[in-house]
């Protein structure tokens, strides 16, 4: 028969023959030959390989460096890498989450549209008319102005995007 030019899934071509790849979590220690099978061994502690492979070395698990604000979100296995996330109040600077930065706060006049997560920063929005924020915060939304009418009061000072309205008593007409 003709020697193969392509192999099945989970195999690789070597010296005109198809050999088994190593399963995830294992590395290649000896290629197959005309007379011998592929030999694979499990990755060591703190190592992984996540695909069918012919790698001679396993990859090291990612280290979640607390000095960079990182912590382990999901411990790695022989088949998966460790997933890092950021400490409370911090978020990743990239998709790979190699370091963290402090969550941004929304300045007065702006409210939190979306609270930050371990992987995304705070999203702020300007307070629209009828709403205000007088604090710098990573959690506070824009608050609606106080409704003086419902308290049987009148507006003494108009509100802004940074301040609430000031209500006062209605002027009584004297007889």
């Amino acid at each position: 028969p003709e020697p193969p030019t392509a192999c099945r899934e989970k195999q690789y071509l070597i010296n005109s023959q198809c050999c088994s790849l190593c399963q995830p979590g294992q590395k290649l220690v000896s290629d197959c030959t005309e007379f011998t099978e592929t030999e694979c061994l499990p990755c060591g502690e703190s190592e992984f390989l996540d695909t069918w492979n012919r790698e001679t070395h396993c990859h090291q698990h990612k280290y979640c460096d607390p000095n960079l604000g990182l912590r382990v979100q999901q411990k790695g296995t022989s088949e998966t890498d460790t997933i890092c996330t950021c400490e409370e109040g911090w978020h990743c600077t990239s998709e790979a989450c190699e370091s963290c930065v402090l969550h941004r706060s929304c300045s007065p006049g702006f409210g939190v549209k979306q609270i930050a997560t371990g992987v995304s920063d705070t999203i702020c929005e300007p307070c629209p008319v009828g709403f205000f924020s007088n604090v710098s915060s990573a959690f506070e939304k824009c608050h609606p102005w106080t409704s003086c009418e419902t308290k049987d009061l009148v507006v003494q000072q108009a509100g802004t995007n940074k301040t609430d309205v000031v209500c006062g008593p209605q002027d009584r007409l004297r007889a």
Epitope: I14, N15, S16, L28, V29, S30, D31, T33, F35, T36, E39, L41, P42, T56
Partner: antibody, heavy 116, light 107 residues
Framework: QVQLQQSGPELVKSGASVKISCKAS????????INWVKQRPGQGLEWIGW????????YCNEQFKGQATLTVDRSSSTAYMLLSSLTSEDSAVYFC?????????WGQGTLVTVSA | DIVMTQSQKFMSTTVGDRVSITCKAS??????VAWYQQKPGQSPKLLIY???NRYTGVPDRFTGSGSGTDFALTIRTMQSEDLADYFC?????????FGGGTKLEIK
């Protein structure tokens, strides 16, 4: 059938360099790792490192880093090992052997003698 | 580095004897062990790989056994052509390392 043909014996001066070769035949040269192994007279075997001709990637035993340089010439299916700054401790037979991990095929060996 | 220890440098045998050569690894190498035979002036020859698999063309009187740290090469019935040096090798981790060798001699 697989054959690994090594270059002939070398007599070199201390401090000099020597380049030995290993010509492969009988298989697809780029598919199998080529290893180099040292054997001093009447002694055991020491693994120097491997080169994968398909990619040129090299893995060397720390003990030989800086002293052994492994290369290949794909056009002639030949692997080379350059040994530099030789001392009397480097007087030995050097073998090339193919395959990863276990060594199914061996060259006949190259005797390197380092003289003062 | 993993140290492979062949405690017997020499072994005296007689044709027809059952001979066992041992090899101990300084840490587990699972089953990634090969055995080689080397005769004077020749290259080593692969006998056993993966601790217990006989390489093609190797007579069935040669048997490999063991896993983890303790391994053995057994010659069921010693023949005169088996007089040689025998080396174990681990290929579980880098650098690959060999035992110091055991020389079989005639009593």
């Amino acid at each position: 059938q697989v054959q690994l043909q090594q270059s002939g014996p070398e007599l070199v001066k201390s401090g000099a360099s020597v380049k030995i070769s290993c010509k492969a035949s009988g298989y697809t040269f780029t598919d199998y790792y080529i290893n180099w192994v040292k054997q001093r007279p009447g002694q055991g075997l020491e693994w120097i490192g491997w080169i994968f001709p398909g990619s040129g990637s090299v893995y060397c035993n720390e003990q030989f880093k800086g002293q052994a340089t492994l290369t290949v010439d794909r056009s002639s299916s030949t692997a080379y090992m350059l040994l530099s700054s030789l001392t009397s401790e480097d007087s030995a037979v050097y073998f090339c052997a193919s395959s990863l991990g276990k060594f199914a095929y061996w060259g006949q060996g190259t005797l390197v003698t380092v003289s003062a | 580095d993993i140290v492979m220890t062949q405690s017997q440098k020499f072994m005296s045998t007689t044709v027809g004897d059952r001979v066992s050569i041992t090899c101990k690894a300084s840490q587990s190498v699972v089953t990634a062990v090969a055995w080689y035979q080397q005769k004077p002036g020749q290259s080593p020859k692969l006998l056993i790989y993966s601790a217990s698999n006989r390489y093609t063309g190797v007579p069935d009187r040669f048997t490999g056994s063991g896993s983890g740290t303790d391994f053995a090469l057994t010659i069921r019935t010693m023949q005169s052509e088996d007089l040689a040096d025998y080396f174990c090798q681990q290929y579980s981790s880098y650098p690959y390392t060999f035992g110091g060798g055991t020389k079989l001699e005639i009593k």
